[in-house]
């Protein structure tokens, strides 16, 4: 699997989207966790509804959600007032049984905020409000790992 | 011109808490920008620990997430440095700076060392 | 973490010389915005780093235009075209484009 890199900014909600084969995976439940480390285990942040029908409710644990929209075949991610600590390796899963098929891994990237100061100048997005108020935006950059790129790079 | 200068007990016992105020002149910290602490170990290397913005939002350093405080007094224009349960490790000179987000850290206390031993 | 890797650690020169210092980032520095907050700071024995370069290649204030930064992406330089006494010290990159945000480990600028 390749990784695809979502870009999201300090304290503002960031989308992942999982698109997969709505027929291969019909009736599966999805998850979303974190890899933790390299070869590590891959720690369960959230799951869809315990019904598989009901899987386009949204389902929270703590800031994150998931919701999928299985006859489009999309696993939606919702990461709210995104932090450092949300930086890192996720994985997108398909659930049957106790197994877990991978449909996306994931790289977090947590940005600096451009609205910590109001004399931003050219922090600002371009075409996007510059009032306080409307810049809860959902962000949602993503792009494949490039090659070079570390998704865990060695601790200094 | 704005100024900031650390202050706050050069030693700390293990397991304590370090406490250090910076102190603002010549500008607001509620006006704008992020008020940041930094601090460099022995040997030179810097650690960014966290900031509190103007409008008092808080990020910090997932490394010290559960240790780390930063608070302010706006009447009085400081902002303050907590950081529990220290350990030999924690021996450093800590600095404030204000980050702006297109010059970085362009202005600096002139650091305070703080000597975590029993 | 981004991690900040400088090279080299300690670079001896003598007074006149050009001296080059090299960053490189474990990820792109480049923001959604389009901007790479890529710094550079001197920190001389015994005081506070002081900013010199910012976003890859604007001098601050009051910097000397023998200071020069350039770069892109994860692949950075400072360039001093000649040395002179006041600029020994340590020179640190730094990047503010991560919410986490990190340093190089410092390069020491000393005579030959």
């Known amino acids: 699997h390749n990784t695809t890199v979502f870009q999201g900014v300090a304290g503002q909600s960031l989308q992942v989207s999982c698109p997969y084969d709505s027929m291969k995976h019909w009736g599966r439940r999805k998850a979303w966790c974190r890899q933790l480390g390299e070869k590590g285990p891959c720690q369960r942040v959230v799951s869809t509804h315990n019904l598989w029908l009901l899987s386009f409710l949204r389902r929270w644990n703590g800031s994150t959600a998931i919701t999928d929209d299985t006859l489009g075949g999309t696993l939606t991610i919702t990461l709210r007032n995104l932090q450092p600590h949300d930086a890192g390796l996720y994985q997108c899963q398909s659930l049957h049984g106790s197994e877990a098929d991978t449909l996306r891994k994931v790289l977090v990237e947590v940005l600096a905020d451009p609205l910590d100061h109001r004399d931003a100048g050219d922090l600002w997005f371009p075409g996007e409000s510059e009032s306080f108020e409307d810049a809860h935006v959902e962000h949602s950059i993503s792009r494949s790992l490039l090659e070079g790129e570390i998704p865990f790079p060695p601790t200094s | 011109d704005v100024q900031l200068q650390e202050s706050g007990p050069g030693l700390v016992k293990p397991s304590q808490s370090l406490s250090l105020t910076c102190t603002v002149t010549?500008?607001?910290?509620?006006?704008?920008?992020?008020w940041n602490w930094i601090r460099q170990f022995p040997g030179n290397k810097l650690e960014w620990m966290g900031y509190i913005n103007y409008s008092g939002r808080t990020i910090y350093n997932p490394s010290l997430k559960s240790r780390i405080s930063i608070t302010r007094d706006t009447s009085k224009n400081h902002f303050f440095l907590q950081l529990i349960s220290v350990t030999t490790e924690d021996t450093a000179t800590y600095y404030c700076?204000?980050?702006?987000?297109?010059?970085?850290?362009?202005?600096w206390g002139q650091g305070t060392l703080v000597t975590v031993s029993a | 973490d981004v991690v900040m890797t400088q090279n080299p650690l300690s670079l001896p020169v003598s007074l006149g010389d050009q001296a080059s210092i090299s960053c490189r980032s474990s990820q792109s520095l480049v923001h959604i915005n389009g901007n790479t907050y890529l710094h550079w700071y001197l920190q001389k024995p015994g005081q506070s780093p002081k900013l010199l370069i910012y976003k890859v290649s604007n001098r601050f204030s009051g910097v000397p235009d023998r200071f020069s930064g350039s770069g892109s992406g994860t692949d950075f330089t400072l360039k001093i075209s000649r040395v002179e006494a006041e600029d020994l010290g340590v020179y640190f990159c730094?990047?503010?484009?991560?919410?986490?945000?990190?340093f190089g480990s410092g390069t020491k600028l000393e005579i030959k």
């Open positions: 730094s990047q503010t484009t991560h919410a986490l945000f990190t």
């Open positions: 010549g500008y607001s910290i509620t006006s704008d920008y992020a």
């Open positions: 700076a204000r980050w702006n987000g297109n010059y970085g850290f362009a202005y």
